[in-house]
Amino acid sequence: NFMYSKTVKRLSKLREYQQYHPSLTCVMEGKDIEDWSCCPTPWTSFQSSCYFISTGMQSWTKSQKNCSVMGADLVVINTREEQDFIIQNLKRNSSYFLGLSDPGGRRHWQWVDQTPYNENVTFWHSGEPNNLDERCAIINFRSSEEWGWNDIHCHVPQKSICKMKKIYI
């Protein structure tokens, strides 16, 4: 029976993934019950991705490693809609690392997953980025401009946002 074997495979995958994420929240994609898309609990989901707000304060490098251990990366923001979704879960008095850095200090910003950096889809606070020694990007709230990006020193501990593609089982 096809449906039975599909269910057995799905349960086997769920059990296997429990060593990394003890609980997954899954939804059926469209009308076809063959495909379930899942995010770890209590990550949030938007379009085809899952997001996790890490409240531990760490450097950019340690924050990225923390994400990668979970099968994710520091967040890459591709659209205004995605940023608008993300900020719903952030605290105004905190700053969060993005997956955006300028390792050479030459203003060659790069996303951690090699998504091309597009000046037209950036949300820097006015006057930012403003320091060649500040080579990592955060998102934070400024009362005058709401949520936007700022460059900071990579070693300064911040909270962070992890993002991964939904898990399909």
């Epitope: 296997e16 993934y17 060593q19 990394y20 490098t61 990225q64 490693k65 990668s68 251990v69 979970m70 099968g71 990366d73 951690v112 997953d113 090699q114 991964m164 593609k165 898990i167 399909y168």
Partner: nanobody
């Protein structure tokens, strides 16, 4: 946790071949995308090759394309790097790296996307 141990390095003449191995222990190997990187003194770790969780996708640095081949054996929990037509500029310490991936075909070419690293194995190519 995943532990990685490289082997197979050594000294070889230009034009020669080596097969590097990276044995993994710890968590389910078949859920980890794998990569090989190399480093020479005073330089950053450089991407060499990567292979997806399923083994169906691979990618290589331009400098090694056509000469290096990455493969994996999930049953043996091992990833391999076959290196042929060696050049003196291939001299480096070669590191194997692992990264959890829930995507069967995803490839990772950037060092900071990997969570776990081996200690490295030295490859020396002389003319």
């Amino acid at each position: 946790q995943v532990q990685l141990q490289e082997s197979g390095g050594g000294s070889v003449q230009a034009g020669g071949s080596l097969r590097l191995s990276c044995a993994a222990s710890g968590r389910t190997f078949s859920n980890y995308a794998m990569g090989w990187f190399r480093q020479t003194p005073g330089k950053e770790r450089e991407f060499v090759a990567t292979i997806s969780v399923s083994g169906s996708s691979t990618d290589y640095a331009d400098s090694v394309k056509g000469r290096f081949t990455i493969s994996r054996d999930n049953a043996k929990k091992t990833v391999y790097l076959q290196i042929n037509s060696l050049k003196t500029e291939d001299t480096a310490v070669y590191y194997c790296a692992a990264r959890l991936s829930f995507d069967n075909t995803a490839l990772y070419t950037s060092a900071n996307r990997y969570s776990y690293w081996g200690q490295g194995t030295q490859v020396t190519v002389s003319s």
